[in-house]
Interface confidence: medium
């Protein structure tokens, strides 16, 4: 019996050659499929093409990356995989929303309001404060600065708000 599998041209790339008595067969490796549509074939008439596993393998809120003969899933930013692996292939894994506001109260800085959203969060300021125009949530340096009244030139005697204004301690009323 001749071992046809000894010939490197007996089967295409990404295929396994199986020698039988007086014959041989080619089978595509896992993650690849035959261009002929047949499970077994001979020679280079068919090729083994990468199966795009990314059509349905990854859970919601994740990105699928197809690799030769395989794939992996990665959760979107703001989501974490339920098995703790950054790149995963397990079918049962979910990408769950992270509550950034609970994880770290300093996410938005002092005098701020952090609001969790699906896959993200947003920062705002409590009454009497407004966002610092030089900071940005995207860069992680969001901050809130006190809103000061513009002082009137005519000082009203015994007016508490005017006095606070001159001392730089007055804040804009919440209403």
């Amino acid at each position: 019996d001749v071992d046809e599998c000894a010939d490197p041209r007996a089967c295409p790339e990404h295929a396994t050659c199986n020698n039988t008595v007086g014959n041989y067969s080619c089978f595509c490796n896992p993650g690849f499929e035959s261009s002929s549509g047949h499970l077994s074939f001979q020679g280079l008439k068919a090729s083994c093409e990468d199966i795009d596993e990314c059509t349905e393998m990854c859970p919601i809120n994740s990105t699928c990356t197809n690799t030769p003969g395989s794939y992996f899933c990665t959760c979107h930013p703001g989501f974490a995989p339920s098995n703790g692996q950054l790149n995963f292939t397990d079918q049962g894994v979910e990408c769950r929303d992270i509550d950034e506001c609970r994880q770290d109260p300093s996410t938005c800085g002092p005098n701020s309001i952090c609001t969790n959203a699906l896959g993200s969060y947003s920062c705002g300021c409590i009454a009497g404060f407004h966002p610092n125009p030089e900071g940005s949530q995207k860069d992680g340096n969001f901050s809130c600065q006190r809103v000061l009244f513009k002082c009137k030139e005519d000082v009203i005697p015994d007016n508490k708000q005017i006095q606070q204004c001159q001392e730089g301690t007055a804040v804009k009323p919440a209403y």
Partner: antibody, heavy 116, light 112 residues
Framework: QVQLKESGPGLVAPSQSLSITCTVS????????IHWVRQPPGKGLEWLGV???????NYNSALMSRLSISKDNSKSQVFLKMNSLQTDDTAIYYC??????????WGQGTTLTVSS | DVFMTQAPLSLPVSLGDQASISCRSS???????????LEWYLQKPGQSPKLLIY???NRFSGVPDRFSGSGSGTDFTLKISRVEAEDLGVYYC?????????FGAGTRLELK
């Protein structure tokens, strides 16, 4: 897999200092804060403190003067240091993380005995 | 500091009973972001605690639907509709809204 593992001295003499290490895997300390919780024998849970992802810390008011938490992001390790130990510091010490929601990831705990 | 008071400290039950545990905070635990970070944990002997409920009423992944949480402001309740043997242990409420963070003293759920 998200894992946290504490390692400590086991036995410490009164008035001495304590250092416990928490080694984490499955996530990065640059993205997640680590909390410390302890439980004296037969008693309840007590929150000790936290080091947030950005490196900021908060501590239990009653223990603040004796506690310090630090970390090494590159080694995936968090350190709990406590000085002037007394017998009532005998407890199981846990490191804990908030992976999604609440304290959903706990270490198995390390037992500390303060005794002469 | 926010103090968390649990009642009762011990709760004897028969399997299949409904159980209810109360948790009261010394001040409002509504976070500045509007969320109330009140959580419930179960600790069984020789094990680390396990998260059951987060943000007052949300069951954590894998927690049976016989567990439910409710409440607002300063008063919170954990209910177990039909107690099973695996539910026995010590239940802790916890507030994660204001540092320093604090646990309740715990409620031991045990068989009559």
């Amino acid at each position: 897999q998200v894992q946290l593992k504490e390692s400590g001295p086991g036995l410490v003499a009164p008035s001495q200092s304590l250092s416990i290490t928490c080694t984490v895997s499955g996530f990065s300390l640059t993205n997640f804060g680590i909390h410390w919780v302890r439980q004296p024998p037969g008693k309840g849970l007590e929150w000790l403190g936290v080091i947030w992802s950005g490196g900021g810390t908060n501590y239990n008011s009653a223990l603040m003067s004796r506690l310090s938490i630090s970390k090494d992001n590159s080694k995936s390790q968090v350190f709990l240091k406590m000085n002037s130990l007394q017998t009532d510091d005998t407890a199981i010490y846990y490191c804990v993380s908030i992976y999604y929601r609440g304290f959903d990831s706990w270490g198995q705990g390390t037992t500390l005995t303060v005794s002469s | 500091d926010v103090f968390m008071t649990q009642a009762p400290l011990s709760l004897p039950v028969s399997l299949g009973d409904q159980a209810s545990i109360s948790c009261r905070s010394s001040q409002s635990i509504v976070h500045s972001n509007g969320n109330t970070y009140l959580e419930w944990y179960l600790q069984k002997p020789g094990q680390s605690p396990k998260l059951l409920i987060y943000r007052v009423s949300n069951r954590f992944s894998g927690v049976p639907d016989r567990f439910s949480g409710s409440g607002s402001g300063t008063d919170f309740t954990l209910k177990i509709s039909r107690v099973e043997a695996e539910d026995l242990g010590v239940y802790y409420c916890f507030q994660g809204s204001h540092v320093p963070l604090t646990f309740g003293a715990g409620t031991r759920l045990e068989l009559k």
